[in-house]
Interface confidence: medium
């Protein structure tokens, strides 16, 4: 069998809401994956499991089952959403995310995703890990690849 390639493309959108009383942030993060089937037969994408980490702590998990099948030498783009919760004990991110006078409130999240594919009864798992910028201060739609974290974080002056 030839390879099945999984490419994490990036964050597609992030929708934010707050609980003022609990000083908690809710971020619904939609991510995009490209899955390429390099085989001459169809494969099933059985499930996608994803989790999001902030400051080394898991803040959200998601699992999608029986997603799709990918034909021979074909590629499919799949979006999946991970609901995340940044609670008060997490370095009071609420205060940063609600600072009204700055335009962008970028935080760095680690996106982890595992894709399970099956063909002829055989199962294969492919995992990816990427650091991404997400704005926790407003609803944002990203150009694909725009949210990638390139290991440069300059504090605002």
């Amino acid at each position: 069998p030839r390879s099945i390639d999984v490419k994490y493309i990036g964050v597609k959108s992030a929708y934010v809401s707050y609980d003022v009383q609990k000083r908690t942030i809710y971020l619904n993060i939609t991510n995009t994956l490209n899955i390429t089937n390099n085989n001459y037969y169809s494969v099933e994408v059985e499930n996608i499991t994803a989790q999001v980490q902030f400051a080394k702590t898991v803040i959200g998990k998601a699992r999608l089952n029986n997603i799709t099948h990918i034909g021979p030498l074909d590629m499919k783009q799949i979006d999946y959403t991970v609901p995340t919760v940044i609670a008060e004990e997490m370095s009071y991110m609420y205060d940063f995310c609600t600072l009204i006078s700055i335009k962008v409130h970028n935080i760095v999240l680690m996106m982890q995703v595992t894709v399970t594919t099956t063909y002829f009864g055989h199962s294969e798992q492919i995992s990816q890990e990427r650091y991404q910028y997400v704005d926790c201060g407003r609803n944002t739609t990203y150009q694909l690849g725009q949210s990638e974290y390139l290991n440069v974080l300059q504090p605002q002056q």
Partner: antibody
Framework: QVQLQQSGAELVRPGTSVKVSCKAS????????IEWVKQRPGQGLEWIGV????????KYNEKFKGKATLTADKSSSTAYMQLSSLTSEDSAVYFC?????????????WGTGTTVTVSS | QIVLTQSPAIMSASPGEKVTISCSAS?????MYWYQQKPGSSPKPWIY???TLASGVPARFSGSGSGTSYSLTISSMEAEDAATYYC?????????FGGGTKLEIK
């Protein structure tokens, strides 16, 4: 140049109140959170609380609830901490500090410190 | 609350000597922060995010650690390094500091 200039030393009577100021210059006060820290003579540092100067949102160390009140005046770019019902235990140097987020939070600029002495 | 325990509380080192100050957290944290304070002055940011030196801090300083165990190291002690060093965590409320390590020059 980013600076936090604090008000001068205070000598106050037990049971009274004092208001310490922290004036920001070289940056917009509302772009950062301001925290307050206590240091008793010859002792370590104690976190009092934090204020978001833009919204007025505050968070206190349980130990200082009812003792310290944090406020900010955007028009004068000044943060304030009022200490009430003062006792000798409140005699200390009080620092304000600007806190920034870069992967995680840290104090990048500290105020000059204000010495509060409670004595009859 | 997370308790940070620094050791030693007081130490002295000769010029050129290697110095290590430890900071132990009562529960696991993401990063450690270090401040230097000299008598009569405000604390200065010294090391942030465990191992990143603040602007102007000499390269002889380094920071390391993870989980509950962190340290600040001076590869070769100099007279100007004599000060009190504090560790601090931002992982959870309330922000807490270590008790401080007073470093003296022999």
């Amino acid at each position: 140049q980013v600076q936090l200039q604090q008000s001068g030393a205070e000598l106050v009577r037990p049971g009274t109140s004092v208001k310490v100021s922290c004036k920001a210059s070289g940056y917009a006060l509302t772009n950062y959170l301001i925290e307050w820290v206590k240091q008793r003579p010859g002792q370590g540092l104690e976190w009092i609380g934090v204020i978001n100067p833009g919204s007025g949102s505050t968070k206190y160390n349980e130990k200082f609830k009812g003792k310290a009140t944090l406020t900010a005046d955007k028009s004068s770019s000044t943060a304030y901490m009022q200490l009430s019902s003062l006792t000798s235990e409140d005699s200390a140097v009080y620092f304000c500090a600007r806190i920034i987020y870069d992967h995680d939070w840290y104090f990048d600029v500290w105020g000059t410190g204000t010495t509060v002495t409670v004595s009859s | 609350q997370i308790v940070l325990t620094q050791s030693p509380a007081i130490m002295s080192a000769s010029p050129g000597e290697k110095v290590t100050i430890s900071c132990s957290a009562s529960s696991s944290i993401s990063y450690m922060y270090w401040y230097q304070q000299k008598p009569g002055s405000s604390p200065k940011p010294w090391i942030y995010r465990t191992s990143t030196l603040a602007s102007g801090v000499p390269a002889r300083f380094s920071g390391s650690g993870s989980g509950t165990s962190y340290s600040l190291t001076i590869s070769s002690m100099e007279a100007e390094d004599a000060a009190t060093y504090y560790c601090q965590q931002y992982h959870s409320y309330p922000r807490t500091f270590g008790g401080g390590t007073k470093l003296e020059i022999k």
